[in-house]
């Protein structure tokens, strides 16, 4: 059991066993490694508190091995709390657990997560809670956890995580969908930014689209178009130094989450991460979800902007791609809130309509 | 102790609107929900919405989300409520509420009785 | 919102006897259910919490039981300062009172 105090009140209580599935270089090309949170695994004093009022919010460290770090950042509002980020550090000059390993450095990988209960509940998922950050996977299992706690032990009441409610019995009737669907005509583009203390930190605008394969409970397997409808969707995000996220709320059923991370040593930004969560009604499994944290997308050097009038391809996972549709994006830097130099995406430089953005 | 002070009783004519204030003490403002109840005898006892001061995340009942606006300054530990466009329907007595560790609304303010005529 | 049904409106029994009133919410509300008395000129007081959780000071008489939609509080020995109207809360999804139910004694 994983505890925070302020004056001998606990405030966060957590317990879980984790596996970080991690991604590193050698020599002779990628290698992965899986690491357990051990039993030694403890909380980090000084790297956790309650968070002060108008400065901070709660915050769980745990520490284990040579370096080792998990941190889980609360945050809440009248009637919910949840895990905003999540973050990890590890140290690949540790040659137990990355054998050779090219780099020495020790790195540090962060992610918004679906973690999220209601006030005065716990969170409990006994299935596996993922997060997928750049080159690593957290995965929690069995956990309970539950901030801005005010007696000292979790609550009687538990908020469960999607992956361990049942499948609702009874759906309602969905239409009948072709299969193939008739493709849908191209997404409306729509502009998106994101800003933190230091002002903007993502200015995007692009047309999307969802290419969903999956398997209907008529177990005939379809693939389906979906256009993001600006006007139904809403747009928030989070400015970090080595993480920027642009999450879209879509007509009430879609979580789609961009994630943009930084290459310090080459000054690029780029699309590194995309997770869905909707919901399709005549799926066999309506709750379609889908995550890669390990994308190299839309790369410009940081200060400019990626333009790309060409659509473009962004495969996600086998049954999930978005499609992308007259995008220009900049990520990290922006100057006074405009785009800066334009970087061409090679379809468009190669296009015979090749057209000149000053 | 936990002490919730409420503004003093109001009239007000039809149509104008009112704005009443909760002043809490004896414990740390950002870290409860303020709730707000409505008392008629009409109607009985209405939850009217809630407001955590710590972000100003306020949500509201449906049957008041446009007649209450609810507010919250940290620096003097007040939550405020303004109820607009009054009719003879809104006069009650108003309570601000603090709820506690899943224990419904504990801590009572006094009561705001607001009388609307014309 | 969560609805909440409550019911007799009113009642009327003698001293001594006993009362019990229901409350019937439109969806599970894992048993965060709280019971109030009220009275007039003064400010609700709350009895019971959790379902079936005596508040300090509370005198036994008072009780509630219940899960999922449906719940029940009983009045048991009726005395002459139980005459007041009594409430129902859930507060499992944001917050919603019952109608109320006035209760006199014969």
């Known amino acids: 059991l994983f505890e925070v105090k302020n004056n001998g009140t606990t405030c966060i209580m957590a317990s879980f066993s984790a596996s970080f599935l991690t991604t590193y270089e050698t020599a002779n090309g990628s290698q992965i490694v899986n690491i357990s949170l051990p039993a030694s695994a403890e909380v980090l004093k000084n790297g956790s508190s309650c968070g002060k009022e108008n400065v901070s919010d709660p915050s769980l460290t745990i520490t284990f091995g040579r370096g080792y770090l998990l941190t889980l950042n609360f945050t809440r509002n009248a009637t919910r709390y949840s895990v905003q980020l999540m973050s990890f550090v590890y140290n690949l000059s540790d040659t137990h657990l990355f054998p050779n390993a090219s780099s020495k450095e020790i790195k540090t990988v962060e992610s918004i997560t679906d973690i999220r209960a209601d006030i005065d509940k716990k969170y409990r998922c006994v299935s596996g809670t993922q997060v997928h950050m750049n080159n690593v996977t957290v995965t929690l299992h069995d956990a309970t956890i539950q901030a801005y706690l005010s007696n000292s032990s979790f609550s009687r009441g538990e908020t469960r995580c999607e992956q361990d409610r049942p499948s609702p019995t009874t759906a309602p009737p969905a239409p009948p969908s072709p299969s193939p669907s008739p493709v849908p005509k191209s997404p409306s583009v729509d502009k998106y930014n994101v800003s933190g203390t230091n002002g903007t930190c993502l200015l995007a605008s692009m047309g999307l689209q969802l290419n969903l394969t999956y398997e209907r409970k008529d177990n005939t397997t379809v693939t389906r178009l979906l256009n993001i409808n600006p006007n139904k969707t809403s747009a928030s995000g989070s400015c970090g130094a080595h993480l920027v996220t642009l999450e879209l709320h879509s007509e009430g059923t879609t979580v789609l989450l961009f994630q943009f991370g930084m290459n310090a040593s080459s000054s690029r930004f780029f699309l590194q991460g995309i997770q869905l969560n909707t919901i399709l009604p005549d799926a066999r499994d309506p709750a379609f979800k889908a995550a890669n944290g390990s994308l190299r997308a839309l790369q410009a050097t940081v200060g400019n902007s990626y333009k790309c009038n060409a659509e473009e391809h962004v495969r996600v996972t086998k049954a999930f791609s978005v499609n992308i549709f007259k995008v220009w994006v900049q990520a990290f830097k922006v100057e006074g809130g405009q785009f800066g130099s334009v970087e061409e995406c090679l379809l468009d430089e190669n296009s015979m309509h090749h057209h000149h953005h000053h | 102790q936990v002490q919730l002070q409420q503004s003093g009783a109001e009239l007000v004519k039809p149509g104008a609107s009112v704005k009443m204030s909760c002043k809490a003490s004896g414990y740390i403002f950002t870290n409860y929900n303020i709730h707000w109840v409505k008392k008629s005898p009409g109607q009985g006892l209405e939850w009217i919405g809630a407001?955590?001061?710590?972000?100003?995340?306020?949500p509201y009942s449906q049957k008041f989300k446009d007649k209450a606006t609810l507010t919250a300054d940290k620096s003097s530990s007040t939550t405020y409520m303004q109820l607009s466009r009054l009719t003879s329907e809104d006069s009650a007595v108003y309570y601000c509420?603090?709820?506690?560790?899943?224990?419904?609304?504990?801590?009572w303010g006094q009561g705001t009785l607001v009388s609307v005529s014309a | 919102d969560i609805q909440m049904t409550q019911s007799p409106p009113s009642l009327s029994a003698s001293l001594g006897g006993k009362v019990t009133i229901t409350c019937k919410a439109s969806?599970?509300?894992?048993?965060?259910m709280a019971w109030y008395q009220d009275k007039p000129g003064k400010g609700p007081r709350l009895l019971i919490h959790d379902t079936s959780t005596l508040q300090p000071g509370i005198p036994s008489r008072f009780s509630g039981s219940g899960s999922g939609r449906d719940y029940s509080f009983s009045i048991s020995n009726l005395e002459p300062e139980d005459i007041a109207t009594y409430y129902c809360l859930q507060y499992d999804n944001l917050w919603t009172f019952g109608g109320g139910t006035k209760l006199e004694i014969k």
């Open positions: 969806q599970d509300i894992d048993r965060y």
């Open positions: 407001i955590y001061p710590g972000n100003g995340d306020a």
């Open positions: 509420v603090r709820a506690n560790w899943d224990v419904a609304f504990a801590y």
